[in-house]
Structure formats: structure tokens, C-alpha cells
């Protein structure tokens, strides 16, 4: 069937438009376009003759329409009268008519739109919007944006007039947005520039800034005042209901206690005509002076006195606060504060306690330190120490000993040889010693300030001969995997070398051995079973050698995986059944039995007589060393057979 | 047989104005529309204005200022007039027939502007 | 408006050598194309319309081509009588306008 698709159906004006036919006859005369649904001889766009492959105009024929051979019809340089029916009229060669009618629309191109509107300062909660999309258009459907985004539903927007209204109403500040209005045809879409709204609103309860209520007498007063409005809002500034200037910043240098009172800020919008105050309270304080420490004992014996520390001056309604060592105060038994927390009292003191300590005064703007104040702890002597450590010296030598012993004030020292006073220095020098010089070495130490002596006696022995040495250890029962053990050679001899054996053979090279002290200490890390030895240590110098006694090792171990012996699982009824348990362990470990998880006895040997099928079942020995801590256990399973 | 034939003054004084007569014979003014185009000495052919058969028209965009084109449907007339002539408007000056292509043409009529 | 541009304002040729003449329009012109030959001292003559249809009693050895913006009139063995200017038109639009020519010389 002869039939006509127009491409495209919506045309825009000044665009074109094929009206394209479909399944045209064959052995055709010609063909005719009109316009309209019907053949009218007065609305003949063109003819065209295939014998001629001529076209014809007819009346209604304006010059832009071309009529290709296929009898196409193209419409060029479309206005909006070309909307309508075109009907094709084609004549066969046997003069036998077929007719066929299709149709197009012709729409604007639209033009950029804009937005009108009846309200260009409209006033918040008070105020609506009326914004108009222009120009009018028909057959135009009309959209509208609001910050790029469709209009939000709320029930205060109403779109009227076919949409091409867009009312705000009840306005609020959150509606000052961008709003477009676009309009659309089958042919184009255009959309408006951004109209912006400005809403005018405010002025909001105004904020004062800082937040700040208190000030210290001679500092400056700097208060800043905002509200939110639309236009900016106009400030002024009453001081207790005065007036005082007309601007959003009050500044009032160097205050005193006089401009204590109420600061009210005022905003005003003089578009919307509305006033808000803001009041706050200023309170402006006397400087208060700078605190400091007295104490009720300057010079406290360790261990003896107690020492309170108040922070002055006394002053009404003040807090106090301390702090020890640039920190606040330790939590302490020994450390007791005052109710109103002025007072803080040190509890038997020690020679840690000496500060320094700092008070504070803590008003509404800021806390006032005191001078750090360090406490003279008095104590000592402690036990004075004599060194070198030497106990035995060649003779011909030079002997300097020297004492120390902590003490405040620092300690007077004397020195005494086999009780008699030797002199009143902290050295004691006496050049090239005999043997007469064998004996008893006494250091006094005496704290003037306490009343207190402490002594310390070393026995210096002066002879060619070095002494026989002995083993001294920091460990003598270490448990296996887990101990250390250090040996240490006695005595510290001076200019002596100190050799090791062990079970009289010199030492392995063990990565679990070290030496040190120069070589006057051997330390055995990790020790095992292995190391329950023999050790001896031997001192030599140019003129005489020794060896100490052997220590043994006494290595704590175990208990290991015990085993029950016989190895028999399988009795008969009728026989004696005679375990034994044994567990590598030192000391020798507790023993206990179990028969199916029932204990037994704490023996070494579980004996029954006579077993019967009834003795069936698991037999469990269980080991514990009570030194080492450790435990350990074997099942056996035994079969009686009848 | 389908005869068309112009006919004009011949030489014209620059700034005077032009009328070409188009005389057609074997078809019918309302069936064929007329087209003008002249062809300057040793140029190209250049498209002028047509008149359709209902009697509107279409100009050449650059001489629609001088130019007018109208008929008799009853003396098989089509008239070219132009006004304000300069020498450059020197060409032969055919009318043919046909609304796209042109498959009927005068033998052209030559016109020399110049005082 | 639309413009013709033949690109060659002569070609020279041989008789019995096949020719092809161009022509390119400044839009798509949906094969509303003409071509015409006009020979020394004469009136032009339409070969061609809508861009391949040769017109009653053209020789078959003329034949057109193209489509969109370019147009070709092929003489697939050029005759001694074919010496003549050869120009493009298209009808797409109003104003109708014609390509410059393209002069065929015999060597």
C-alpha cells in the first residue's frame, strides 16, 4: 500500500522536511503533491511527468519544495503555515489513480527564555514569589530549576498558569537559591539565566564574641557583635543602657573594675525594619597578687620530719592548686592537702621529696604561679662504701683507699686502723706497705646536721702469698632451661689473674659461657643437667698461685617422661602385678598412681596380687617436682587374660 | 516544439535600467516556470531569478535589490527588468525553462553596458 | 547560499580517453545536481539531473555520479564533439547557483 512517513514528524521552523514514500507503483505516468487531505486543484504543489522527467508548480508551489524522482517530496526553509496533511496523488499508466496522505507539524524554534518576577526583595515569613517564565509559547511545556536540581515538593511551592508560574510562598532565607525556567517543544529546549533570589531577612538574636564574661583590671576589652540579615545589619552598642557608638566591634582599652556591667548589642535591618538585642554581663576583676610558698621547716630530717607548705596569701573564694616537679600532684599517702587546699603537707619525708614545688591562685580568667620553692631534705649518712674492693695487696705497694656514703649536708669522714683514729679525711693514703699493715680498716661517717654516724669495715690483708680463693654464687640451686648462674672468685685480689676449670679440665667454648670482671666472674646461661660440674677457680700473680675447692653444680631438672617398667601389657589371671615408675629428676620427684583415673597411692611401685580380668584397663604414674615446679605422667594399658 | 527567445536592447548607458523579454512558444506559461542567467564574456553562467507558474519568484540574493521578474501568461511573455546597470552587468542573458534543472533555453540576447 | 567549486577550470584529454570532471558543493545537496554542456557560440544543454539521470538524447557514453557534497560527469570515451565547457548546478536550494565550468580541450 502506497503510504507516506514524513521525516521528521515534528519540524522546527527555518529546518526542512522529506515526506518520503513508501512502496510507490510501477509503470507510473506521474504523480502530484498537494497540500492538504485531498486532490484540490488549487492547492497543487507540484506535478511531475516521468515521460518528460519534468516537474510542473502548481499554485501552491512557493519555491522550496523539491520533488525527487522517487516522488519524494522535500519541504526546505519550513514556516509554521507548511503544518498540515500533504496528500500524493499518483496516476498509473493505465490512468488508474492511487492516492496517499501524510502529515507534519511545524513548531518554533523557541527562544532563550526569562525569568520575570513580582517581588525582587521579598521579605522572610512575610513575603510569596510569583516567578514567570517568558515569553508565553504556545504548545510549550514549561520546567523549572532550583539550583540546577527540579523543584523539591514542598507545600510551599505551587507552580500555576500551565507551570509557566512558579510561586514561592512564605519566602524563607534557604529560598535564596538560582532558580531557571527552561521551555521545551517537540523541536528544542531552551533554558533562562539564573535569577537569584534575595531574600531578605533577620536580623537573628545577635552573638557577642568572645564568650568571655571575666577580665582581669588593665586589660582591653574587645567585643564583636554579628547577626545574620539580609541586608548586612547595623550595629549598636549600650553599656548599661547607654548609649555608647554605632559599630559591629566595641573596643575599650586598659579596663578597670568600673566597666564591670551589662553590654547590650542591638542589630537592625533597615530593609525589613526589625530590631534584636543581645545582653551580656562583663565583670572586670582586681589583679591579684602574685602567691608564694612558706614553710614550717626548712631543713626536715629524712624519715623523721613532716613539712607543710602554704601557699599565701590568704584570699577569700580562691582556689589553690599545687604542682610538684612541673606535674600536678602525685597520688601519695605521704602528701595530705588542706580543706581549702592552701596547705600541703609532706608526711615523713625522704631525700626524694625535694621538690621544686610551685602554688597556684586560680581566679575566673587565669591561675597565678608562685616562685618554685626546693626543699632541703636532710639525711645520711647512708652506709659508706671503701673502695677499690681489693682486700689483698703485695707489699712495697701504695694504699689509697677512699669512703663515700650519701649524706645531707654532705658527711665528715674518719678513718680508723684496728680501732684506733687514724685522721679525719675521706682518703686514706699510706705508701709501700708491709705486712704489718694487715688488719681491720674502719670509715666513720657522720651527718652533723642529724647527729647521725654510719661505719664500714674491710679487712686488708698485705702478703706475697695470694690466699686460697673460694666460689661464691648469686645461685646455688638454678632450675634447667629456665636459671642463670654467675660464680664469682673471691677475694678481688690487685694485680691477679683469675683462671676457671671445670670437673678439672679448662673451659669448653660455649656460647652459654661468659666471662667477666676480668675474668673474675663466670656466668652459665640457661643451665642444663649437663652443668652439674665441678668448678674450681684459680688465682696468680708474679710471686704465688692458688685454687679455691670445688662447688658442684646443683642444677634443678625434671621430671622427665617417666617409664614404667616391666614393659608387659599382658598378664594372667592369677599373677602379681609389680610396677615401678621411674622419672630423671632432681630432687627425686613425688610419685602417684592411677587406675582408669581413680589414684592409687603415692608410691614409687604399685604391687597387686593375684590381678583378675577386673585389674583391665589404663595405669597412669604421675611425677612432680616440687622445686622445679613441673609435672609429668605415662599411661600403660594392661590386659589380665582369664 | 518547445521554442523560447530573448529579446533586448543591446547596449545600455551605465545607471539606466535593463528589460529583457522571454517569448515562449509549445507550452504554456501556467505548466513551466522561467528562469534568467546570464554568462559574462569568456565567464561562467550565473542563475538570476525564476518565476514559477503561479506567478511568485525567487531572486539571486546578491542583485534581489535590482532585479524584477513578471509575466504574461496570456502573450507567452516573461519580463527581466534591473535597474541601475554598470558595466560589469555586461553578459548574454538566456531565459530557460524548468524548476531545478533547466532543459529548455533561449539562444540568449547580448547586452553591452556601456556610455 | 550553496556553493559549486569545479576544481579544474580546463582538462585536456585525447579522443577515446575516458574523463572525469568534479564538482563539490559547501552542503549536502541530496543529488539535486545538473550537469550542462555549452559549446562554443552556444546555448547550454542539460546532460544530467538528479546527479545520474542523463537527459532524452544524451549519448550513453555521459554518465554522472555522487552523492552528499561531491559530483562526478564521467565521458567514458571522449569524442571530438565533446570540446565544450561543462558546468555543475544544484537545485537543493533557492538560489539556485552553478559551478565556475570546466573547459574540455582535445590535444
Known amino acids: 500500500k502506497l503510504t507516506i512517513e514524513s521525516t521528521p514528524f515534528n519540524v522546527a521552523e527555518g529546518k526542512e522536511v522529506l515526506l518520503l514514500v513508501h512502496n510507490l507503483p510501477q509503470h507510473l505516468f506521474g504523480y502530484s503533491w498537494y497540500k492538504g487531505e485531498r486532490v484540490d486543484g488549487n492547492r497543487q504543489i507540484i506535478g511531475y511527468v516521468i515521460g518528460t522527467q519534468q516537474a510542473t508548480p502548481g499554485p501552491a508551489y512557493s519555491g522550496r519544495e523539491i520533488i525527487y524522482p522517487n516522488a519524494s517530496l522535500l519541504i526546505q526553509n519550513i514556516i509554521q503555515n507548511d503544518t498540515g496533511f500533504y496528500t500524493l496523488h499518483v496516476i498509473k499508466s493505465d490512468l488508474v489513480n492511487e492516492e496517499a496522505t501524510g502529515q507534519f507539524r511545524v513548531y518554533p524554534e523557541l527562544p532563550k527564555p526569562s525569568i520575570s518576577s513580582n517581588n525582587s526583595k521579598p521579605v522572610e515569613d512575610k513575603d510569596a514569589v510569583a516567578f514567570t517564565c517568558e515569553p508565553e509559547t504556545q504548545d510549550a511545556t514549561y520546567l523549572w530549576w532550583v539550583n540546577n536540581q527540579s523543584l523539591p515538593v514542598s507545600p510551599r511551592l505551587q507552580l500555576s498558569n500551565g507551570n509557566r508560574t512558579l510561586t514561592l510562598f512564605n519566602v524563607t532565607r534557604n529560598d535564596t537559591a538560582s532558580y531557571k525556567c527552561e521551555t521545551q517543544n517537540p523541536v528544542s529546549a531552551r533554558r533562562s539565566d539564573s535569577v537569584i533570589l534575595n531574600v531578605l531577612y533577620g536580623p537573628d538574636a545577635p552573638t557577642i564574641s568572645p564568650l568571655n564574661t571575666s577580665y582581669r583590671s588593665g586589660e582591653n576589652l574587645n567585643l564583636s557583635c554579628h547577626a545574620a540579615s539580609n541586608p548586612p545589619a547595623q550595629y549598636s552598642w549600650f553599656v548599661n543602657g547607654t548609649f555608647q557608638q554605632s559599630t559591629q566591634e566595641l573596643f575599650i582599652p586598659n579596663i578597670t573594675v568600673n566597666n564591670s556591667g551589662s553590654y547590650t548589642c542591638q542589630a537592625h535591618n533597615s530593609d525589613t525594619g526589625l530590631n534584636r538585642t543581645t545582653v551580656t554581663t562583663i565583670t572586670v576583676y582586681a589583679e591579684p597578687p602574685k602567691p608564694f610558698i612558706t614553710s614550717n621547716n626548712s631543713n626536715p630530717v629524712e624519715d623523721e620530719d613532716a613539712v607543710a607548705l602554704t601557699c599565701e596569701p590568704e584570699i577569700q573564694n580562691t582556689t589553690y592548686l599545687w604542682w610538684v616537679n612541673n606535674q600536678s600532684l602525685p597520688v601519695s599517702p605521704r602528701l595530705q592537702l588542706s580543706n581549702d587546699n592552701r596547705t600541703l603537707t609532706l608526711l615523713s619525708v625522704t631525700r626524694n621529696d625535694v621538690g621544686p614545688y610551685e602554688c597556684g591562685i586560680q581566679n575566673e580568667l587565669s591561675v597565678d604561679h608562685s616562685d618554685p620553692v626546693i626543699l632541703n631534705v636532710l639525711y645520711g649518712p647512708d652506709d659508706p662504701t671503701i673502695s677499690p674492693s681489693y682486700t689483698y695487696y703485695r707489699p712495697g705497694v701504695n694504699l689509697s683507699l677512699s669512703c663515700h656514703a650519701a649524706s645531707n649536708p654532705p658527711a665528715q669522714y674518719s678513718w680508723l686502723i684496728d680501732g684506733n683514729i687514724q685522721q679525719h679525711t675521706q682518703e686514706l693514703f699510706i705508701s709501700n706497705i708491709t705486712e704489718k699493715n694487715s688488719g681491720l680498716y674502719t670509715c666513720q661517717a657522720n651527718n652533723s646536721a642529724s647527729g647521725h654516724s654510719r661505719t664500714t669495715v674491710k679487712t686488708i690483708t698485705v702478703s706475697a702469698e695470694l690466699p686460697k680463693p673460694s666460689i661464691s654464687s648469686n645461685n646455688s640451686k638454678p632450675v634447667e632451661d629456665k636459671d642463670a648462674v654467675a660464680f664469682t672468685c673471691e677475694p678481688e685480689a690487685q694485680n691477679t689473674t683469675y683462671l676457671w676449670w671445670v670437673n678439672g679440665q679448662s673451659l669448653p667454648v660455649s656460647p652459654r659461657l661468659q666471662l667477666s670482671n676480668g675474668n673474675r666472674t663466670l656466668t652459665l646461661f640457661n643451665v642444663t643437667r649437663n652443668d652439674a660440674r665441678a668448678y674450681v677457680c684459680g688465682i696468680q700473680n708474679s710471686v704465688s698461685a692458688n685454687r679455691s675447692d670445688p662447688v658442684t653444680l646443683d642444677v634443678l631438672y625434671g621430671p622427665d617422661t617417666p617409664i614404667i617398667s616391666p614393659p608387659d601389657s599382658s598378664y594372667l589371671s592369677g599373677a602379681n602385678l609389680n610396677l615401678s615408675c621411674h622419672s630423671a629428676s632432681n630432687p627425686s620427684p613425688q610419685y602417684s598412681w592411677r587406675i582408669n583415673g581413680i589414684p592409687q597411692q603415692h608410691t614409687q611401685v604399685l604391687f597387686i596380687a593375684k590381678i583378675t580380668p577386673n585389674n583391665n584397663g589404663t595405669y597412669a604414674c604421675f611425677v612432680s617436682n616440687l622445686a622445679t615446679g613441673r609435672n609429668n605422667s605415662i599411661v600403660k594399658s594392661i590386659t589380665v587374660s582369664a | 516544439q518547445v521554442q523560447l527567445k530573448e529579446s533586448g536592447p543591446g547596449l545600455v548607458a551605465p545607471s539606466q535600467n535593463l528589460s529583457i523579454t522571454c517569448t515562449v512558444s509549445g507550452f504554456s506559461l501556467t505548466s513551466y516556470a522561467i528562469n534568467w542567467v546570464r554568462q559574462p564574456p569568456g565567464k561562467g553562467l550565473e542563475w538570476l531569478g525564476i518565476?514559477?507558474?503561479?506567478?511568485?519568484?525567487n531572486y539571486n540574493s546578491a542583485l534581489k535589490s535590482r532585479l524584477s521578474i513578471s509575466k504574461d501568461n496570456s502573450k507567452s511573455q516573461v519580463f527581466l527588468k534591473m535597474n541601475s546597470l554598470q558595466t560589469d552587468d555586461t553578459a548574454r542573458y538566456y531565459c530557460?525553462?524548468?524548476?531545478?534543472?533547466?532543459?529548455?533555453w533561449g539562444l540568449g540576447t547580448t547586452l553591452t553596458v556601456s556610455s | 547560499d550553496i556553493v559549486m567549486t569545479q576544481s579544474h577550470k580546463f582538462m585536456s584529454t585525447s579522443v577515446g580517453d575516458r574523463v572525469s570532471i568534479t564538482c563539490k558543493a559547501s552542503?549536502?545537496?541530496?543529488?539535486?545536481v545538473a550537469w550542462y554542456q555549452q559549446k562554443p557560440g552556444q546555448s547550454p544543454k542539460v546532460l544530467i539531473f538528479?546527479?545520474?539521470t542523463r537527459h532524452t538524447g544524451v549519448p550513453d557514453r555521459f554518465t554522472g555520479s555522487g552523492s552528499g557534497t561531491d559530483y562526478t560527469l564521467t565521458i567514458s570515451s571522449v569524442q571530438a564533439e565533446d570540446l565544450a565547457l561543462y558546468y555543475c548546478q544544484q537545485y537543493y536550494r533557492t538560489p539556485r547557483t552553478f559551478g565556475g565550468g570546466t573547459k574540455l580541450e582535445i590535444k
Open positions: 552542503q549536502d545537496v541530496t543529488t539535486a
Open positions: 518565476i514559477w507558474t503561479g506567478g511568485g519568484t
Open positions: 530557460a525553462s524548468g524548476v531545478y534543472y533547466f532543459d529548455y
Open positions: 538528479w546527479a545520474s
